[in-house]
């Protein structure tokens, strides 16, 4: 229905600290580079502007739209152009522009300082001190740093963040309560950032359809007892939602999925089984939990898919006269009997089925020539089942650490004019596969790996993008979504390449490492290990274990060396000059 | 609860019209092809067609003319359409849900039938 | 295609194993479903896609066969399984059909 006054409108239906927190994170990922106290300050006056409308709707300015009022307060910014270039151009821009010009002007990669978290001390004062203001600091610096957060589920994590903060700060040893929960919620927090931003790039790259039939197939994989209109009436709220928050109507965003958990919750018996533990929690939780239910049990008696979708005479009438719902069908039917494949495999799967029907229904004799179709999605089921096993095999024998040097060695054979810290940042999130998934059972590990493999390499996408300098990876990231991470696994080493020359100062280290948490040490060595890889394409696995265990050896030497310095000015020579007579 | 239920059954005269109507609870019809089948007295069972999720329906050959499935996915109802009716059509007419939106069978779900009886 | 179902009537005992055939005048691969009848209800899913027991269903019914000829057997007969017994193949949109019936019945 129609409001009034919008701002109003969605004020009342969110209360005023989601209103305050949704429009803070609103800015914050359009406006980067803004101080907190800069966005808190027009926070304060939309909220201001907010409750004098929900006092009279009929009020100047209120019944303006969402965009209109956050737009002229983005633009109301002083120093705006010098701040941020040509984003200041779209202040010259009328809506819907603006809105799309903002947008596009979000970077994914915004040189910002890594987000320190204080130690815990100090981290405790200033949240008893001032609670609200803490968490404002909180949601502005992730939501600058990942200007494609989902925002309802930020304002979830705000609320873990909260809750830890305030069950650890009463604590005597608040360092040792904080340290291992604040982890787990961050470590959550950048999963989910890097899953979110690939339903966006899906969204802005294929549309609403593409991102539709993900949902679909997520949904039935969650939901198999729902049936098809249910599934379908889910996937286009859920649409909805995600379409919302990418295109950074968060305050719409947040009010349709609370309406989504809303519904969810009173229509459990047409759903699934598994949602009352979830239905019973505040809104937050609620959503998020309803967002990763565990799958239902799967219904008895479904028969063979081949009966509707192979065997029948008129597979090509069906498709041809309702080709929509006819592949809807199949996506939703597979789905449901296959929680144990990934949604990406369930895509191409689909897309392999359709493909087929186009060639085969304008053939002489239709049957014959789908009829084969199952058989042919085999090999596309055995490719990330055998990737699963491989993987999760050199995860086991080598360790987190150890796998994800296996994965930077690969990837900088396969893209080696990609940027060192990118190839270190993807080796290091792809390597982290290993940990959160191959430890699931076995009926859990391909969607698991699969989708967040498919999610760490959009991210590589999307930075690459900004400065495209691999053939091999443009090649990859400009074919579908779900085809993506095939194309990755399947890159070999780049032959256009023409190695780096060896330069002593990319390895020759210092002291200061030696102080360093062991997350930078590794990092460090790890830049050292492309650099290597740049220099020598070719070399073996061998040879730069051979490399990197002296390397190691020497660090472990000054480090515990009495004088630190003068081991790494007389060792660090003699360790390049071993590193180079091994690679050559 | 998951169920369908006939309605529109009787007493009709040779050369008559009849429409039946099959409600559906508990789920959404539109999921569903939806099959009519019916049953002379003492006698086997006989499929007439079906509806399906992309809303083709496909007929016995025998029906085709004077059957007609249709329906009303607002009122989670189906229909069937009977047209110059004869004595031979005196059965028990069954609404009866497919297992999928394209699939004639199996049909797990079945409604408790309305009788029709064509008689002068 | 035509559906063949043997024997039209059968009379057994309790304990008894009782098999009824169904012949598909062509290959409808594991097409086929068996129900069971009782005088004024509709009919019961047992079987489908040709040996898959619907939940619910006593484990003494079981199904076999595919392409052409398929069975419907009980290994044990029961009081309650006295009835009319209906074998359906559903090869496509266009075609489904159902056998002739076998009427079940207590010997003597």
């Known amino acids: 229905e129609a409001h009034k006054s919008e701002i109003a409108h969605r004020y009342n239906d969110l209360g005023e600290q989601h209103f305050k927190g949704l429009v803070l994170i609103a800015f914050s990922q359009y406006l980067q580079k803004c101080s907190y106290d800069e966005h808190a300050k027009l926070v304060q006056e939309v909220t201001d502007f907010a409750k004098t409308c929900v006092a009279d709707e009929s009020a100047a300015n209120c019944d303006k739209s969402l965009h209109t009022l956050f737009g002229d307060k983005l633009c109301a910014i002083p120093n705006l152009r010098e701040n941020y270039g040509e984003l200041a151009d779209c202040c010259t821009k009328q809506e819907p522009e603006r809105n799309e010009c903002f947008l596009q002007h979000k970077d994914d990669n915004p040189s910002l300082p890594p987000f320190e978290r204080p130690e815990a001390e100090a981290m405790c004062t200033s949240f008893k001190e001032n609670p609200t203001t803490f968490m404002g600091h909180y949601l502005h610096e992730v939501a600058r740093r990942h200007p494609y957060f989902y925002a309802p589920e930020l304002l979830y994590y705000a609320e873990q963040y909260n809750e830890i903060l305030t069950q650890c700060c009463a604590e005597a040893d608040k360092e040792s309560c904080l340290t291992p929960k604040l982890d787990g919620v961050k470590e959550k927090a950048l999963v989910s950032s890097v899953r979110q931003r690939m339903k966006c790039s899906s969204m802005q790259k294929f549309g609403e359809r593409a991102f539709k039939a993900w949902a679909v197939a997520r949904l039935s994989q969650t939901f198999p007892n729902a049936d098809f209109a249910e599934i379908t009436k889910l996937a286009t709220d859920l649409t909805k939602v995600n379409k919302e928050c990418c295109h950074g109507d968060l305050l719409e965003c947040a009010d349709d999925r609370a309406e989504l958990a809303k519904y969810m919750c009173e229509n459990q018996a047409t759903i699934s089984s598994k949602l009352q533990t979830c239905c019973d929690k505040p809104l937050l939780k609620k959503a998020h939990c309803l967002s990763e239910v565990e799958h239902d049990t799967m219904p008895a008696d479904l028969p063979a898919i081949a009966a509707d979708f192979v065997e029948d005479q008129e597979v090509c009438k069906n498709y041809a006269e309702a080709k929509d719902v006819f592949l809807g069908t199949f996506l939703y039917e597979y789905s449901r009997r296959h929680p144990d494949y990934s949604v990406s495999l369930l895509l191409r799967l689909a897309k392999k089925y359709e493909a087929t029907l186009e060639k085969c229904c304008a053939e002489a004799n239709p049957p014959a020539c789908y009829g084969t179709v199952l058989a042919e999605f085999q090999p596309l089921v055995e490719e990330p089942k055998n990737l699963v096993k491989t993987n999760c095999d050199l995860y086991e024998k080598l360790g987190e650490y150890g796998f994800q040097n296996a994965i930077l060695v690969r990837y900088t054979q396969k893209a080696p004019q990609v940027s060192t810290p990118t190839l270190v940042e993807a080796a290091r999130n792809l390597g982290r596969v290993g940990t959160k998934c191959c430890t699931l059972p076995e009926d859990q590990r391909l969607p698991c790996v699969e989708d967040y493999l498919s999610a760490i390499l959009n991210r590589v996408c999307l930075l690459h993008e900004k400065t495209p300098v691999s053939e091999h990876v443009t090649k990859c990231c400009s074919g579908s979504l779900v085809e993506r991470r095939p194309c990755f696994s399947a890159l070999t080493v780049d032959e256009t390449y023409v190695p780096k020359e060896f330069k002593a100062e990319t390895f020759t280290f210092h002291s200061d490492i030696c102080t360093l948490p062991e997350k930078e040490k590794q990092i460090k060595k790890q830049t050292a290990l492309a650099e290597l890889v740049k220099h020598k394409p070719k070399a073996t696995a061998e040879q730069l274990k051979t490399v990197m265990d002296d390397f190691a050896q020497f660090l472990d030497t000054c480090c515990k060396a009495a004088d630190k310095d003068t081991c790494f000015s007389t060792e660090g020579p003699n360790l390049v000059t071993r590193c180079k007579d091994a690679l050559a | 609860e998951v169920q369908l239920v006939e309605s529109g059954g009787g007493l009709v005269q040779p050369g008559g019209s009849l429409r039946l109507s099959c409600a559906a609870s508990?789920?959404?019809?539109?999921?569903?092809?939806m099959n009519w089948v019916r049953q002379a007295p003492g006698k086997g069972l006989e499929w007439i067609g079906h509806?399906?999720?992309?809303?083709?329906?496909y007929y016995a050959t025998w029906a085709k003319g004077r059957f007609t499935i249709s329906r009303d996915n607002s009122k989670n109802t189906v229909y069937l359409q009977m047209n110059s009716l004869r004595a031979e059509d005196t059965a028990v007419y069954f609404c009866?849900?497919?297992?999928?939106?394209?699939?004639?069978?199996?049909?797990?779900?079945w409604g408790q039938g309305t009788l029709v009886t064509v008689s002068s | 295609f035509e559906l063949t179902q043997s024997p039209s009537s059968l009379s057994a005992s309790v304990g008894d194993r009782v098999t009824i055939t169904c012949q598909a005048s062509?290959?409808?691969?594991?097409?086929l479903a068996w129900y069971q009848q009782k005088p004024g209800q509709p009919p019961k899913l047992l079987i489908y896609?040709?040996?898959d027991l619907t939940s619910g269903v006593p484990s003494r019914f079981s199904g076999s066969g595919s392409g052409t000829d398929f069975t419907l057997t009980i290994s044990s007969l029961q009081p309650e399984d006295f009835a009319t017994y209906y074998c359906?193949?559903?090869?496509?949109?266009?075609?489904?059909?159902f056998g002739g019936g076998t009427k079940l019945t207590v010997l003597g």
């Open positions: 009866a849900r497919g297992a999928g939106g394209f699939s004639t069978g199996p049909f797990k779900l």
């Open positions: 508990g789920f959404s019809l539109s999921s569903y092809a």
């Open positions: 509806i399906n999720a992309g809303d083709i329906a």
């Open positions: 062509e290959s409808i691969n594991s097409r």
């Open positions: 896609d040709a040996s």
């Open positions: 359906q193949g559903y090869g496509g949109s266009s075609t489904t059909t």
